[in-house]
């Protein structure tokens, strides 16, 4: 399809690296959420950090290419990494406009399918890129 994908764009303070160059930021007339029009894919992504009491968004934006998962209509996150004990990074990829604005659901920490608490540990910035 010819139309380009538009995704929510967000990068939490302190996150190393940026995916801003994967698209063109749009003027939406509001401060947040920001929107980005993808240059190299028709695929959005989102990364959330799930701890015992809350899920916090870490990054949202465009992927650099279309990959498995990008055909999904909704953001269905799956566990990817452990930035620190007690927290898990969940990522999603999806292929409709603003589909990365929020996730459909997150499994509770420690539930089946979530990497064990002895999974790989990484510095916060590094873990984001592991998740991507």
């Amino acid at each position: 399809p010819p139309n380009r994908r538009t995704c929510v764009f967000f990068e939490a303070p302190g996150v190393r690296g940026s995916t801003k160059t994967l698209g063109e930021l749009l003027d939406t007339g509001t401060e947040l959420p920001r929107a980005i029009r993808c240059l190299y894919s028709r695929c959005c992504f989102g990364i959330w950090n799930l701890t015992q009491d809350r899920a916090q968004v870490e990054m949202q934006g465009c992927r650099d290419s279309d990959e498995p998962g990008c055909e999904s209509l909704h953001c269905d996150p799956s566990p990817r990494a452990h930035p620190s004990p007690g927290s898990t990074l969940f990522t999603c990829s999806c292929g409709t406009d603003f589909c990365n604005a929020n996730y459909s659901h997150l499994p509770p920490p420690g539930s089946p399918g979530t990497p064990g608490s002895q999974g790989p540990q990484a510095a916060p910035g590094e873990s984001i890129w592991m998740a991507l």
Partner: antibody, heavy 117, light 111 residues
Framework: QVQLQESGPGLVKPSETLSLTCTVS?????????WNWIRQFPGKGLEWMGY???????SYNPSLKSRITISRDTSKNQFFLQLSSVTAEDTAVYYC??????????WGQGTLVTVSS | DIVLTQSPSSLSVSVGDRATITCRAS??????????MHWYQQKPGQPPKLLIY???NLESGIPARFSGSGSRTDFTLTISSVQPEDFATYYC?????????FGGGTKLEIK
Amino acid sequence: QVQLQESGPGLVKPSETLSLTCTVSGYSITSDFAWNWIRQFPGKGLEWMGYISFSGSTSYNPSLKSRITISRDTSKNQFFLQLSSVTAEDTAVYYCAGSRYSWFAYWGQGTLVTVSS
Amino acid sequence: DIVLTQSPSSLSVSVGDRATITCRASESVDTYGNSFMHWYQQKPGQPPKLLIYRASNLESGIPARFSGSGSRTDFTLTISSVQPEDFATYYCQQSNEDPYTFGGGTKLEIK
């Protein structure tokens, strides 16, 4: 600053494959940008042909999709155009261009390719 | 593909005059209110040079006498006071949809 330079044969025979090279200086083709080929026909019309991105993904104009291949050599900081089964209608000035966004801020000087027997 | 029609195809003006070139798209080139229309200047033997991006943003180093406006399907490039070095051919380009397409060009000539 980003500089681009096209090179390749100025004359190609009908039904053969047109091959051009774009050499980029002042910027790594793996750092960022889309690296495009654009041609300008003798009547002055411009046509975007396709790109290879910094990550190596490609996008082509559907009108050329069956004939075009864009590739790269990251060690030489070059990217390439191959256009197969050429006809006289492919005679044009061929430009390579770098784009951070979806417009073209950086252009080579262009090279004229004539398709003739 | 989106077809861009420029008018006029040629325009004769005197130095100091105001010049207006229009570009009409066969369908909207806006995404959520952002216009993906761009303008270039080309002189003989040279590649096109970016003047205006996203309808109204002046590229770095381009004189302020150049301006762009418009949205959806109708766009305008204006040169407020034409200078001798402005005599060239001008092209619009859309990037709202793949494939990117260009207008047929407007040649600005000396009257």
